[in-house]
């Protein structure tokens, strides 16, 4: 190797200056007794190199690029060799931004997978490899005092969510949770959440069913629907409130919301609907009165209201 580049910093803030030096060893100067060192950023030649012979006979060229406006580029130093450029050395330069503070950190407890799933918004593009780590600890109080640390949760590349498995959780006890973002230009941390995993529990919705008509029960009135639901068994002991939504299958009507319904109701007669009309219905529930997240809406149930009963006209017969 005849030449060697060293740079003030290979990674800088976008738009910042960067200084580089290229040294050609003495045993390479047979190429030219006074070789002129050229600089190139990407494909463009860069003027402004200051060249000098050092006391040990090596040649040095120093260049300052006033603003590195490329997020990634190769800087090379070269010599003219006949009609072509002979590249002596090159370095990769990166430019970008330190990570912004991750924001909108939120978590939910999934009782099916037995894990606490946290997600966040990473902020604007940094143009640099940036790692995110979900950090947490157990706390007896309101997270002012730190208890046992929990193993860091590292999301897969490009993902802005991470799952803390059950073995690292303690239900009914607060946890401090935050996201740390790190790249070559700095580190940032989101505001800390302090939560009990059960307070962010997201339940599975009940399953809507048609109510089986019983011989002694009166059929639904016109414009009414009788429905029941089967609660999600693993969440049965959690007090919940639920809500229904319905809309006619045809037309552009928006969903109409009915609630709150206690989970324990298990069956419901919905009235005030259009007669002889097919409706789509869904139900969802939330832990209540304790905190929690709404479940997803249940799979749809499709039911049809009964026809309006014909009006009977009474004719009086005179004898």
């Amino acid at each position: 190797e005849c030449g060697h580049i060293s740079v003030s910093a290979p990674i800088v803030h976008l738009g910042d200056p960067i200084t580089a030096s290229c040294i050609i060893k003495q045993n390479c100067s047979h190429l030219d007794p006074e070789p002129q060192i050229l600089w190139r950023l990407g494909a463009e030649l860069q003027p402004g190199g200051r060249q000098q012979r050092l006391s040990d006979g090596t040649q040095e060229s120093i260049i300052t690029l006033p603003h590195l406006n490329h997020t990634q580029a190769f800087l090379s130093c070269a010599l003219n060799w006949g009609n072509s450029l002979q590249i002596l050395d090159q370095v990769e330069l990166r430019a970008g931004y330190p990570p912004a503070i991750p924001h909108n950190l939120s978590c939910l407890m999934n009782l099916t997978t037995s894990s606490l799933i946290c997600q966040w918004e990473p902020g604007p593009e940094t143009h640099l490899p940036t790692s995110f780590t979900l950090k947490s600890f157990k706390s007896r109080g309101n997270c002012q005092t730190q208890g046992d640390s929990i193993l860091d949760c590292v999301p897969k590349d490009g993902q802005s969510h991470c799952s803390i498995p059950r073995k690292h959780l303690l239900l009914y006890q607060n946890m401090g949770i935050w996201v740390q973002a790190e790249n070559a230009l700095g580190t940032s941390m989101s505001p800390q959440l302090c939560l009990d995993p059960m307070d962010v529990v997201k339940l599975e919705p009940p399953m809507l069913r048609t109510m089986d008509p019983s011989p002694e029960a009166a059929p639904p009135q016109a414009g009414c629907l009788q429905l029941s639901w089967e609660p999600w068994q693993p969440g049965l002991h959690i007090n919940q409130k639920c809500e229904l939504r319905h809309k006619p299958q045809r037309g552009e009507a928006s969903w109409a919301l009915v609630g709150p319904l206690p989970l324990e109701a298990l069956q419901y007669e919905l009235c005030g609907l259009l007669p002889a009309t097919a409706y789509t219905l869904q139900i969802r529930c939330i832990r209540w009165p304790l905190p929690g997240h709404w479940s997803d809406w249940s799979p749809s149930l499709e039911l049809r209201t009964t026809e309006r009963a014909p009006t009977h006209h009474h004719h009086h017969h005179h004898h």
């Epitope: 009782l111 609660p231 068994q233 693993p234 002991h237 009165p289």
Partner: antibody
């Protein structure tokens, strides 16, 4: 401190009836599921029945279905188990317990002994 | 119905021993598995809920692990007061079922 106190156990003839009570204190009774678990002499634990916070949901073990009825009076903070058509195999210590949100029993009462014998 | 099989049904151990009790569900129950300790003439006492959560006031030598169908209760260093019968219980769905129990006796 959460406390559960069962009463109403005793000796009863086969085919007879008995009503167990469980008086609760130290927590908001109306917010929790409650349950009955029994233990025959020298045997393991057997779940009998549970009741939801407002009484609308009442699952039963197959062995007692149709004979036992669980109920609660939230105004009196009391849980009940009405036992009819009693059989010798119903002889056990009956415990009442508060159910946690994910279905564990804690705490338990001290238990009341029901003996079905002629 | 979900059946719960506990093993062993009894074991003899010495103070200071590490003791492991297993519980197997006949179908997947996620983490809905609870462990109890019962001493003669006393009501059961909750040790572990939701497979691995230590109930308040229970010594840290007790731990629970597992998910799906296979679960373990471990006592890291058996103490004199730990000689008792231990039960597992599934709370995933009704009917609720208990395991048959494991009696831990002094060797």
């Amino acid at each position: 401190e959460v406390q559960l106190l069962e009463s109403g156990g005793g000796l009863v003839q086969p085919g007879g009836s008995l009503r167990l009570s469980c008086a609760a204190s130290g927590f908001t009774f109306s917010l929790y599921w409650m349950g009955w678990v029994r233990q025959a002499p020298g045997k393991g634990l057997e779940w009998v029945s549970s009741i939801s916070s407002s009484g609308g949901v009442t699952p039963y073990a197959d062995s007692v279905k149709g004979r036992f009825t669980i109920s609660r009076d939230n105004s009196k903070n009391t849980l009940y188990l009405q036992m009819n058509s009693l059989r010798a195999e119903d002889t056990a210590v009956y415990y009442c317990a508060k159910l946690g949100e994910l279905g564990w029993f804690d705490p338990w009462g001290q238990g009341t002994l029901v003996t079905v014998s002629s | 119905d979900i059946q719960m099989t506990q093993s062993p049904s009894s074991l003899s151990a010495s103070v200071g021993d590490r003791v492991t009790i297993t519980c197997r569900a006949s179908q997947g129950i996620s983490s809905y598995l609870n462990w109890y300790q019962q001493k003669p003439g006393k009501a059961p006492k909750l040790l572990i809920y939701y497979a691995s959560n230590l109930q308040n006031g229970v010594p840290s030598r007790f731990s629970g692990s597992g998910s799906g169908t296979d679960f373990t209760l471990t006592i890291s260093s058996l103490q004199p007061e730990d000689f008792a019968t231990y039960y597992c219980q599934q709370s995933y769905m009704y009917p609720i079922k208990f395991g048959g129990g494991t009696k831990v006796e002094i060797k």
